[in-house]
């Protein structure tokens, strides 16, 4: 059976965890409340090093952070496996590493958006992640919460895979949409989002340079290269993909 | 100066007990609450491997299973120390024990421990 938090003093409901945590979320419900960098051991996972954000909806794992084109996040198929990049910088955690920490369970996945001017966005999602066997699909499992849903993500059941260029999953038969555009994604038809293209500090004159950048269709456009991503994610308890 | 100073090292028979205390000091411990700390340790001809390790909090202690059930890590962030109870020892357990400081919020990893003690030897013998 796996471990569970033991309770120090039932009466404030402090626990105490006599093995690394599984994930943020469980740090969270041991009582943790800074948010950083922890190294966490997924059940059957070694150890690995991870972002988290503590808030008042609990402990989130940050998967993936842009915000100043230090990291090229133009790579194969075994980077975005493994992940890649800075903790304390721009990174992606590896899509093995998600996974480790989903399991078979649905997940709350956050997106942080902002744009040039300043102005935020926020986004959330229940999803189901696949395994390498799925190439990590991604599924939406229950609609999204605000109002730019519609035409970003598959709609409701439909699951999409992982691609990156030299691994081409995407929905488009005609087109791998990580070569024609730029970095690894839950390509569908290539047009409604990429966090991982190519960073832009100022706007390319071309529409094909520009069409590579990272998009999130539904906010600010197809064509408005974004200033900073951040994607977190959080396990639901003890909830089991249908 | 940054210090981790280890003590209560020593000999002991196989199935005693020892207390080892780390004190830190240094401009750098002046917030010792926002470091996690651990405990490794370095038998002769071996690679340090990692004991226990406390967070900032003492909420989450991680212990190797070598010394689960055996050996209790604690912290007192008033005093900037740390200890580790060792009970039920056994003659592996003979090693140079080091404390060792983190930014990390809790790890088991030599490479994510920033400041570390000179070390206190324990010798389980009979």
């Known amino acids: 059976l796996p471990e569970m938090a033991q309770p120090v003093d039932p009466a404030h409901n402090v626990s105490r965890l006599h093995r690394l945590p599984r994930d943020c979320q469980e740090l969270f419900q041991v009582g943790e409340r800074q948010s950083g960098l922890f190294e966490i051991q997924p059940q059957g996972s070694p150890p690995f090093l991870v972002n988290c954000k503590m808030t008042s909806d609990g402990g989130w794992t940050v998967i993936q952070r842009r915000h100043d084109g230090s990291v090229d996040f133009n790579r194969p198929w075994e980077a975005y496996k493994a992940g890649f990049g800075d903790p304390h910088g721009e990174f992606w955690l590896g899509l093995e590493k998600v996974h480790s920490i989903t399991g078979d369970r649905n997940s709350r996945l956050a997106v942080q958006l902002r744009d040039w001017d300043g102005n935020a966005e926020l986004l959330q999602f229940s999803v189901h992640l696949g395994g390498e066997d799925t190439a990590y699909s991604l599924q939406l499992t229950a609609p999204v919460a605000g109002q730019l849903g519609a035409t970003t993500v598959p709609p409701s059941g439909l699951s999409v895979p992982f691609s990156t260029w030299d691994q081409d999953h995407d929905l488009r038969r005609d087109k791998n949409c990580a070569k024609s555009l730029s970095g690894g994604w839950w390509f569908g038809t290539c047009s409604h989002s990429n966090l991982n293209g190519q960073y832009f500090r100022s706007i390319p004159q071309q529409r094909q340079k520009l069409k590579k950048g990272i998009f999130w269709k539904t906010w600010r456009g197809r064509y408005y290269p974004l200033q900073a991503t951040t994607m977190l994610i959080q396990p639901m308890a003890a909830e089991a993909a249908s | 100066e940054v210090q981790l100073v280890e003590s209560g090292g020593g000999l002991v028979q196989p199935g005693g007990s020892l207390r080892l205390s780390c004190a830190a000091s240094g401009r750098t411990f002046s917030t010792f609450n926002t470091y996690s700390m651990g405990w490794f340790r370095q038998a002769p001809g071996k690679e340090r491997e990692f004991v226990a390790a406390i967070s900032r909090g003492g909420n989450v202690t991680p212990y190797a299973d070598s010394v689960k059930g055996r050996f209790a890590i604690s912290r007192d962030n008033a005093k900037n120390t740390v200890a580790l109870q060792m009970n039920s020892l056994k003659p592996e357990d003979t090693a140079v024990y080091y404390c060792?400081?983190?930014?990390?919020?809790?790890?088991?990893?030599?490479?994510?421990?920033?400041?570390w003690g000179q070390g206190t030897q324990v010798t389980v013998s009979s």
């Open positions: 060792a400081a983190s930014k990390i919020g809790i790890a088991s990893t030599i490479r994510y421990y920033d400041y």
